[in-house]
């Protein structure tokens, strides 16, 4: 805490430039009128402040906003936002995209710190949903944060965001995260045709449903094995032969190396013997 | 380099109870998403439960209402309580967890060696 002292005489600061950085921090906090720094913050960046300094102008701040800082301010804090505190950030109401990304770059190459954790989740919640535009900033930052999502956060993305999302941004999804980001990917690619739906579709397909199986099954989509084993069993399970070799085309021959495996091993035990012998692969039910 | 050590397996009768942990080092804060796999012999490993960085947690249907997982965030660690089991739980179980936005050695996910469960009829 720095003592209220009276500023020396010819030391009042008319804007905020270079020739602060020779102020103590007493005449940093007795010199420099809070309205002025607010008004001229895009300037702090450019002025090379010792941290000590950083913390003077922090708590003048804190001071003119008790109640949390307008977003004018927050949005030129460049390096001073390194110095504040959850609590502080709990305080803002952010809502402008070009502010969340500017102190994102601020916190580039730094690890996610809780203060950046609670300005996403302020500006998350603010917002009421995981807009395109959002999901493909913080993706951009942080790849592999939609998977640092749980299923219940992940519900208030909007099946417009899901265009933004790419194949590796679900790499490390869970099953359950899969349950529900597919239904919002087949609302968001619904008017698109057979191949380019498929190619889309299919890095969602981990929690599709059966009828939505068997309906791709007539649309010869060749799915991989790669994908056919990350689709649930229970979705895969009440398909029949037919409808597997028609989803996977040329790649049913695949079956034979995964047959110990979930989900192939669990369908084929559900199958008849007479219908996987039409397959010609050997497999045993 | 961010390490994961699980503990807590063993040998059990049908019916009985195991708790696992998993306690995450390496790493200082960032978001973490914790996750329990298994894999019975022969078999590719499958997903059973998450614990996500809100606090919120899922599984795999047919653990659901038998096992609970839970955390303790001063020691990074991730436990995994499995009542009821069933020999159909048999199988090496592993910890995993994810990290964004952590400057950390290697690539997310990590993986821990796992703890084998085996429950007998």
């Known amino acids: 805490e720095v003592e209220k002292t009276a500023c020396p005489s010819g030391k009042k600061a008319r804007e905020i430039d270079e020739s602060l950085i020779f102020y103590k921090k007493w005449e940093l906090e007795a010199c420099v009128d809070a309205a002025l720094l607010a008004t001229q913050m895009d300037r702090v960046n450019a002025i090379p402040f010792t941290y000590e300094q950083l913390d003077v102008l922090k708590h003048k701040l804190d001071e003119l906003y008790p109640q949390g800082y307008p977003e004018s301010v927050i949005q030129h804090l460049g390096y001073l936002f390194l110095k504040m505190s959850p609590e502080d950030i709990r305080k803002w109401n952010v809502t402008s995209l070009e502010t969340l990304k500017a102190l994102l770059e601020v916190n580039k190459g730094h690890e996610m710190s809780p203060q950046v954790a609670t300005l996403i989740d302020r500006f998350v919640k603010g917002r009421g949903q995981l807009d395109k535009d959002t999901l493909d900033t913080l993706t951009a930052f942080y790849p592999g944060y939609l998977c640092s999502l749980s299923p219940e956060e992940l519900s208030s993305v909007p099946p417009s965001s899901i265009w933004a999302v790419r194949p590796q941004d679900l790499d490390t999804c869970d099953p359950r995260q899969l349950d529900v980001l597919y239904p919002k990917a087949r609302l968001a690619f619904q008017n698109m045709n057979g191949s380019e739906y498929f190619v889309k579709i299919q890095s969602f397909l981990g929690g599709a449903p059966t009828e939505d199986l068997k309906a791709l099954s007539q649309q010869n989509v060749s799915m991989d094995l790669a994908t056919f084993m990350k689709l649930r069993t229970d979705a895969v399970l009440p398909l029949t032969v037919a409808e597997v070799q028609k989803l996977l085309g040329p790649h049913v021959e695949g079956l034979k190396a995964e047959e110990r495996h979930r989900p192939v091993r669990d369908w084929i035990l559900r199958q008849r013997q007479d219908d996987l012998d039409t397959l010609g692969l050997g497999l045993q039910g | 380099e961010v390490q994961l050590a699980e503990s807590g397996g063993g040998s059990v009768q049908a019916g009985g109870s195991l708790r696992l942990s998993c306690a995450a080092s390496?790493?200082?804060?960032?978001?973490?998403?914790m996750r329990w796999y298994r894999q019975a012999p022969g078999n590719v490993r499958e997903f059973v439960s998450a614990?996500?960085?809100?606090?919120?947690?899922s599984y795999t249907d047919s653990v659901k209402g038998r096992f609970t997982i839970s955390q303790d965030n001063a020691k990074n660690t991730v436990y995994l309580q499995m009542n009821s089991l069933q020999p159909e739980d048999t199988a090496m179980y592993y910890c995993?967890?994810?990290?964004?936005?952590?400057?950390?050695?290697?690539?997310?996910?990590?993986w821990g060696q796992g703890t084998q469960v085996t429950v007998s009829s």
């Open positions: 995993r967890i994810d990290l964004v936005g952590c400057n950390v050695a290697g690539g997310s996910p990590y």
């Open positions: 390496g790493y200082s804060y960032c978001r973490s998403t």
């Open positions: 614990i996500y960085s809100d606090g919120t947690t």
